[in-house]
């Protein structure tokens, strides 16, 4: 016989099964071509000396073999005399040490027994009730297939898991999906119901992320605000890169982690937007207010969890930047003009008070006056800090008031709100004799000088009943006592206290009667 | 489910053609084999040409260097041309779809060779 063909006489060994645990297995016949066919086998046991023999049976009953050698693979054509339109049976005869092992057999067609290809392209991932599925377009002429999924982790070797039959243009694979370490997946695929059928080679790699991102493990520091009222967020540490399985090493598409920064502006409620979502690579400039700023990590699953930072405002004050006048009509405020076109947001809040109570107005863009200055108002009707207490006043400005990275802040200030000069008299004027021609005068601190920056100073007035002369003393507004000396003894004086701001003088308290008894020597 | 309808049969003198058409009622690619099987009254049906994966083609030893077997992607169609027709290729021709595990067969259309 030709080696080339199937041989149709009896083998060249006896035909006894030993009935041993080891010999050939796992037979695999299928079509490689338009003309050409192969078979396989695994051979279990010591291979030294072993012949294998490819045995068929026709539908006639005839039989015939091909000689093998010592090889587990055999290919052969369609002018073989093996009949490759009809059902054929095949298995192999190992002959070794004087004995001959047999495969189980395999009943088939050989013209349409075809080694399948893996899945092809892309291949769909998806999360399914706290699995993972795997979908992809069925190759072409393949429907049909059982299918294979092996899977590893960066720590764990593969682990073999069955996706179940297919019979469609789509086939699908429900796999698991690992909390928190990244997986590597590949698939295989054989044709369905028929015997013998051999597995396709294993597909690229499929990278899987875990079903929670990594929570992003990083710091912040925000730069000291700038002359143009801005201040940089910078990062201090950068988020952990993911470990992945070797396949996935290097180009891995599908197991990226995308770390996202929102923003959410806490000062200035009134404006139109409070938050944005920034890439984390590009750091931006914020205002002087209060920021929480969230890092979000996420995966083609979508957010994991996130890590929340509170930026506090910046409170460095300005104290004369910000003129006041109160009229009858209202008041307006005025302050250096930014540029052309801005739009600014004035935010007051009582002091001391949770900053949950601020209050805010947006004005319409506006451009400089003539000096120079930007400016607001309110009637008193509106009640705009109106009442007698103290107020921490910022303005934030912005030529695009819709994007919250380009406030900025232009001061921040205390006002004191009301009738600040009433409000501000000084309550409790004291007189005490301190020599023979001075006295002490104390008094109570004026409401004003809870505000920082708001009192300029006191101004004591003393006047002399007799010659109606008057004087009059300033005094820091961190003190509240003064001494008034050059006094005449049984003169009667009258003293009163005022408190002043930088642009309101204010109310005389009530005055208060003394004299200085004349001393009488004995 | 896959519908196949064969055309294209009749009588023709020896020495003569015919082609057949299969239409499937999908994409034949998603077929992965499609062939032609004739029967003869009284007889088994017989395997004549087959189309596998597409692209590998088979013939039964009594029609090779005669029968043709070829498919048209865009038309969802199978053809088998059939030259120099004896009389013994009269029978019933049958168009077979293999989807997957499932099986589907056209109606057969008469082919029948005699002068």
């Known amino acids: 016989c030709r080696t080339s063909e199937c041989c149709f006489q009896d083998p060249p060994y006896p035909d006894a099964d030993s009935g041993s645990a080891s010999g050939p297995r796992d037979l695999r016949c299928y079509r490689i071509s338009s003309d050409r066919y192969e078979c396989s086998w695994q051979y279990e046991g010591p291979t030294a000396g072993v012949s294998h023999f490819l045995r068929c049976c026709l539908s006639s009953g005839r039989c015939c073999y091909f000689a093998a050698g010592s090889a587990t693979r055999l290919q052969f054509s369609d002018q073989a005399g093996v009949s490759v339109l009809y059902t054929v049976t095949l298995w192999v005869e190992s002959w070794a040490r004087n004995q001959t092992e047999k495969s189980p057999e395999v009943t088939l067609q050989l013209y349409n027994s075809v080694k399948y290809e893996p899945p092809l392209g892309d291949i769909k991932v998806s999360k399914l009730a706290g699995q993972l599925r795997m979908e992809w377009e069925t190759p072409d002429n393949q429907v049909g297939a059982e299918v294979q999924f092996r899977h590893r982790t960066p720590s764990s070797p593969w682990k073999l898991g069955d996706c179940g039959p297919q019979d469609d243009d789509t086939e699908s694979c429900l796999c698991p999906l690992e909390m928190n370490v990244a997986q590597e997946f590949q698939l295989r695929r054989r044709q369905l119901g028929s015997q013998g059928s051999s597995w396709s080679k294993w597909s690229s790699p499929v990278c899987v992320p875990p079903e929670n991102p990594p929570q992003p493990q990083v710091r912040f520091s925000v730069e000291q605000l700038g002359q143009d009222g801005r201040r940089r967020l910078t990062l201090k540490e950068q988020p952990t890169q993911l470990e992945l399985p070797e396949g996935c090493q290097g180009l891995a598409p599908g197991t990226e982690v995308t770390y996202r920064l929102q923003l959410h502006m806490l000062s200035c409620p009134c404006k139109a937007k409070a938050t944005r979502t920034l890439h984390l690579g590009k750091m931006p400039y914020l205002s002087g207010a209060a920021y929480n700023v969230a890092v979000i990590s996420s995966n083609q699953f979508g957010p994991g969890l996130n890590q929340t930072w509170h930026i506090p405002a910046d409170t460095h004050t300005e104290p004369v930047a910000l003129n006041i006048s109160v009229g009858t009509n209202g008041t307006t405020m005025y302050w250096p003009a930014r540029a052309q076109s801005m739009t600014y947001c004035i935010e007051w809040q009582p002091v001391g008070q949770d900053g949950g109570l601020a209050t805010c107005s947006l004005t319409a863009p506006q451009d400089p006056d003539p000096a120079g200055m930007a400016t607001y108002s309110w009637s008193r009707e509106s009640g705009a800090m109106g009442q007698e207490k103290c107020y921490y006043i910022t303005i934030f400005a912005s030529a695009h008031p819709e994007k919250l990275t380009l406030w900025s802040t232009v001061l921040s200030t205390y006002h004191f709100g009301g009738n600040a000069s009433a409000a501000g008299t000084p309550h409790h004027v004291s007189v005490k004799n301190h020599s023979l021609d001075s006295v002490s005068v104390d008094w109570a601190p004026s409401l004003l000088s809870t505000c920082p920056g708001v009192l300029k100073e006191y101004v004591v007035r003393c006047r002399d009943e007799d010659s109606k002369q008057v004087s009059e003393h300033p005094v820091q507004p961190t003190e509240t006592q003064v001494t008034l000396s050059g006094l005449r003894a049984g003169v009667a004086y009258t003293v009163q206290v005022r408190a002043d701001t930088a642009w309101l003088r204010g109310v005389w308290s009530q005055p208060q009667r003394f004299s200085i008894e004349v001393q009488v020597s004995d | 489910e896959v519908q196949l309808v064969e055309s294209g049969g009749g009588l023709v003198q020896p020495g003569g053609s015919l082609r057949l058409s299969c239409k499937a009622s999908?994409?034949?690619?998603?077929?992965?084999?499609m062939d032609w099987h004739r029967q003869v009254p009284g007889k088994q049906r017989e395997l004549v040409a087959a189309i596998v994966n597409g692209v590998w083609k088979n013939y039964a030893d009594s029609v090779k260097g005669r029968f043709t077997i070829s498919r048209d992607n865009a038309e969802n169609t199978v053809y088998l041309q059939m030259n120099n027709l004896k009389p013994e290729d009269t029978a019933v021709y049958y168009c077979h779809a293999k989807r997957g595990v499932s099986d589907y067969w056209g109606q057969g259309t008469q082919v029948t060779v005699s002068s």
């Open positions: 999908r994409s034949i690619f998603s077929i992965n084999t």
